[in-house]
Interface confidence: low
């Protein structure tokens, strides 16, 4: 917003106008207009000779503007010479600009037909358990005037959840400076926002337009079970589709899968609607949509629709999801060499083959750098020649390996360590 | 939008669930929930033993998730062990999750009371001189169904100038698939935008909600005088202020200053409203606002309001805006030295003092680097010793310099040049 008092010089012609005289024979004026303005209107420099006499001044296009800068990139400078015979120290010239045709617009305003009542102020919310009282005030001028009385007015309260648009907001009308919103108006555990405007009551002698909206007020509705799906709505397109939507908290939707179920009559079987489309709704909710086919609206005019957790199942086949218990491992010394021996927990089914993975390493190495061997259905493994006077570690794991059976490796057995003997010097 | 078919696994518990068995005595399951979900709802792992028997599985908190990654930053891993005596190659376990309380919502939809008619399609604009015809179509399903008939519907057309908000848009109702907008609806030389939605007609047996809005259509209204102020509106607050606003093309406002003038009755004197507030309105227009005081609405119930060019004047006093004609300059040689002499155009008023500014320079210098002298009421100046065999230039300008008189320097005189004589060598 910019403010200008009546009389403020603001046009480019007036801003740029400069007039100098030689105090003998003439006045020279320079000013500028803009190319953009000239497309729409031409203005003429006017000299007021006295209270009644306005004289147009003839001006030519000019190449420069030596006396003032033009505040616009596409200025059109002009220069005008006004012959003048007499100069007195008290002389003042009055210059203005006049458009090349009458410009303006006019309106006759009958006050009773052009009323915009004052906007509600001090909009506040107070709570009484699960009811919410909106109150506001409206300034009707001095009480003695009585031109606009409370009976001329009504109030339009619109309210919505924070995440919804005003276009879809609900409306309440009130003929007092308050309105009550109860559980029938509000969804639980939601943040609401409301605003109010003043309207002229239908029976009033006055007409015009509503006030501006009041500033908004926010509040949290009555607490409720936030895990429940909310705002289930269904609308029939009049042809063949019943479109339903509902909302779920994002955190709940991450743990519980909801479906839309419907019956075209109370005694029909329940069916699940598919596909479900999802969209984010603010930061807290997800809105879900699904379209139910309506093959015969004339026969089945009432649908029972529900949102329920879906029994979404995971099917896990035992024989391909086996993880055996880890083997138990021992280390034995056979003469100069070492062997690893292990046992698996007895399985009820002896036809299932086992694959073993054996790792052994020096104490100074990591399992990542260990030696790894894979054996089929074996329960022992002779180790190759090892370094003397060294601590070693070994571990083993098992998995099933027969066609038709699968799974993942068992956990590793408990790791076993042993020290190899020192070698006697040969002297 | 995301799409999910009924049955798609989408919850985090189901995504993360992995179960492995030792094919002998037990099944071990691991899964995760989120801290955020737990605040609102707890879910339990359920094993379906057969078609009718669902068994909850007891699970403990776990420190890790070795079998799957959790797609959420705040996961809570769990581990469950299910004893199991018998394993067969055809065994399949069915696992699901169940919330800790009944969740869901239910709606009985009577189709006739939950109708949202289809949105208008193919919205188009055509022109006939200064009238504009909006046409559209609406799909009502197969003709033989007759469930929703054209008589059940009406259309809400809203239209506005591009720069206005939909909240302030005008509304037209139509019971056919077209609407005509004429000069009485549209301001000239403006770009308009319209949209349409389908509503249930007041006399219909059906209820519900309007359709979505159609896509928008744009057009340019009939041409007009774009320099004219437009959209003058005034509204009385019912107390003491008549608020008026009007719009002007930005280019016009840069050259013509408009004011708001008012009379509280036809025979009252016209007054100008102040202050005027301005705001941008799109890229082409400026909206102006002013508030007219209404001291006595009961007595003066009709105001005549007009927007007109203001005679914004610039007052220019002759005696302080003098620019004399440039002097005429000559150079004379007096013996070995040079003098500058000048004359000013004869002024009618001899009592006005003159100040002269004289500049002289060598041919090789610029005026910026010249010697400058200032003299009062003089008409000549002797030059100091100059370099021999050198071309010099001089110029002079004049301004008034008496108390009560002011102005700006004249233009420079025509510059004069001369060559100094060479000096004979002394031998």
């Amino acid at each position: 917003w910019e403010r200008s008092l009546a009389g403020a010089e603001e046009t480019i012609p007036l801003q740029t106008l400069r007039c100098y005289n030689d105090y003998t024979s003439h006045i020279t004026c320079r000013w500028a207009d803009t190319q953009d303005a000239q497309r729409l209107v031409n203005v003429t420099l006017i000299r007021r000779v006295n209270e009644d006499l306005l004289e147009p001044v003839s001006c030519d296009l000019s190449d420069d503007m030596p006396w003032s800068a033009c505040p616009h990139p596409r200025c059109v400078p002009r220069r005008c010479v006004i012959p003048c015979q007499s100069f007195v120290v008290t002389d003042v010239d009055y210059f203005s600009f006049q458009p090349d045709r009458p410009l303006g617009t006019r309106l006759t305003v009958t006050l009773t037909q052009h009323v915009q009542p004052p906007e509600p102020r001090d909009l506040q919310i107070s709570t009484d358990q699960d009811h919410f009282l909106l109150t506001w005030s409206v300034a009707l001028g001095s009480p003695q005037s009585h031109w606009l009385s409370p009976g001329d007015l009504e109030f339009e309260v619109v309210y919505k959840r924070l995440q919804d648009s005003w276009e879809d907001a609900a409306i309440l009308l009130s003929n007092t400076s308050q309105a009550t919103l109860g559980p029938e108006h509000l969804m639980p555990s939601s943040t609401y926002v409301a605003r109010v405007r003043t309207r002229l009551a239908p029976g009033s002698r006055l007409s015009g337009r509503p006030s501006k909206w009041s500033p908004e007020v926010c509040w949290d509705s009555q607490p409720g079970d936030e895990a429940q799906p909310q705002n289930l709505e269904c609308f029939f397109d009049g042809a063949a589709v019943l479109s339903c939507s509902w909302e779920v908290r994002k955190e709940v939707a991450s743990s519980v899968s909801f479906g839309l179920f419907y019956k075209p009559s109370p005694d029909a079987g329940e069916e699940e609607c598919s596909p479900v489309l999802r969209e984010g709704l603010g930061s807290l909710h997800t809105r879900h949509h699904c379209q139910i086919p309506v093959p015969d609206p004339a026969t089945h005019g009432q649908y029972i629709v529900s949102v329920q957790p879906r029994r979404a199942e995971k099917h896990i086949k035992s024989s391909v999801n086996i993880q055996m218990a880890p083997p138990s491992l021992n280390v034995t010394k056979d003469g100069d060499s070492y062997s690893l021996r292990w046992e698996t927990m007895k399985m009820r089914y002896e036809h299932i083959d086992h694959t073993f993975e054996i790792q052994y390493r020096k104490d100074t190495a990591t399992w990542k750098d260990s030696k790894t061997e894979t054996l089929q259905n074996a329960h022992s493994m002779a180790l190759p020649a090892l370094e003397p006077s060294t601590r070693y570690w070994a571990r083993v794991r098992v998995r099933t390996s027969r066609t038709g059976y699968n799974g993942i490796w068992s956990e590793w057995s408990e790791a076993r360590s042993w020290d190899t003997e020192s070698v006697l010097p040969m002297w | 939008w995301e799409r999910s078919l009924a049955g798609a696994e989408e919850t985090i518990p189901l995504q993360t669930l992995r179960c492995y068995n030792d094919y002998t005595s037990h099944i071990t399951c691991r899964w995760a929930d989120t801290q955020d979900a737990q605040r609102l709802v707890n879910v339990t792992l359920i094993r379906r033993v057969n078609e009718d028997l669902l068994e909850p599985v007891s699970c403990d908190l776990s420190d890790d998730m070795p079998w799957s990654a959790c797609p959420h930053p705040r996961c809570v891993p769990r581990r469950c062990v299910i004893p199991c005596q018998s394993f067969v190659v055809t065994d399949v376990d069915y696992f699901s999750f169940q919330p800790d309380r009944p969740l869901g919502t239910r709606l009985t939809v009577t189709l006739t009371q939950h109708v949202q008619p289809p949105e208008p399609r193919d919205l188009q604009i055509s022109t006939d001189q200064d009238h504009f015809l909006l046409t559209w179509s609406v799909a009502l399903g197969s003709p033989q169904s007759h469930w929703l008939s054209p008589g059940d519907l009406e259309f809400e057309v809203v239209y506005k100038r591009l720069q206005d908000s939909w909240e302030d848009a005008a509304i037209l109702l139509s019971n056919t698939s077209q609407a005509t907008l004429g000069p009485e609806h549209l301001m000239p030389s403006s770009t308009y935008v319209a949209r349409v939605r389908t509503r249930l007609a007041p006399g219909s047996r059906l209820s519900g909600r309007p359709s979505k809005w159609s896509p928008e259509v744009c057009w340019d209204s009939q041409p007009g005088d774009e320099a004219q102020p437009q959209n003058l509106e005034c509204f009385f607050d019912g107390a003491a202020v008549l608020s008026c606003s009007w719009e002007v093309r930005k280019e016009v406002a840069s050259s013509v200053s408009f004011g708001l003038f008012y009379k509280p009755s036809p025979d009252a004197g016209e007054e100008e409203c102040s202050p005027v507030l301005r705001e941008g309105l799109g890229s082409l227009h400026t909206r102006h606002h002013c508030q007219i005081p209404v001291p006595d609405p009961a007595t003066h119930g009709q105001y005549i309001v007009s927007v007109q060019p203001r005679r914004a004047e610039k007052h220019i006093k002759s005696s302080v805006n003098i620019q004399m004609a440039p002097p005429s300059l000559n150079v004379t040689k007096d013996g070995d030295s040079y003098s500058l002499r000048w004359e000013t155009m004869k002024m009618r008023y001899e009592h006005i003092d003159h100040t002269f500014e004289i500049q002289y320079r060598k041919d090789t210098a610029t005026w910026k680097d010249s010697k400058t002298e200032t003299l009062q009421n003089a008409h000549s100046m002797a030059l100091p010793a100059l370099e021999p065999s050198t071309r010099y230039w001089a110029r002079v300008r004049v301004r008034t310099s008496r108390t009560g008189y002011n102005g700006i320097w004249s233009e420079w005189s025509e510059a004069r040049s001369w060559d100094t004589e060479s000096v004979l060598p002394m031998w």
């Epitope: 500033p215 908004e216 926010c218 | 107390a239 003491a240 202020v241 507030l277 508030q291």
Partner: antibody, heavy 122, light 107 residues
Amino acid sequence: EVQLVESGGGLVKPGGSLRLSCEASGFTLSSYTMNWVRQAPGKGLEWVSSIRSSSSFIYYADSVKGRFTISRDIAKNSLYLQINSLRAEDTAVYYCARDYYGSGSYWYFDLWGRGTLVTVSS
Amino acid sequence: EIVLTQSPATLSLSPGERATLSCRASQSVSSYLAWYQQKPGQAPRLLIYDASNRATGIPARFSGSGSGTDFTLTISSLEPEDFAVYYCQQRSNWPLTFGGGTKVEIK
């Protein structure tokens, strides 16, 4: 030049009274909503009182209600604040401020005076 | 009453740096919030009104944003004359209230 100049501050004992003046020049004070805002030494700003351009609307902060009175003299183009029953916590620089929106009454302040200091001390 | 909390209390920055000042309302004030600058010994000066509109004559380096309860004043590149105390003010509800101020000082 458009400006506001406050005067009338000074040292006063608890329970005492003062009348602060604010003289406007360069604009018509009665065309604007006018306000008093104060600032205790080294502290932030506190709104005190407002008078709408129509004069029919006057507002006060709870802390001064019943003790302070805002008024104006159209002929003198001046705004006043009569302050009675002064307390130590009323010690502050008192600024006169013009509303940004003229008779639209916007409740933001675009033109301020330099302030006048009121000290309440025994 | 609506309480406006400004943070930080003090911001130490060098000329040319970007300054971000915060103002939080105890309840929604929609976009009805202004920012002022005050230098020692001087009256406040209106910078921004209605959360994001620059007042007349205010340089483009000052910008405001936010609505509801959280608002920000940004000075894109600090000039020496920008070191001052900044206050926010709401007009959503009576009484009109100001924040406690943020002092922007030279580092």
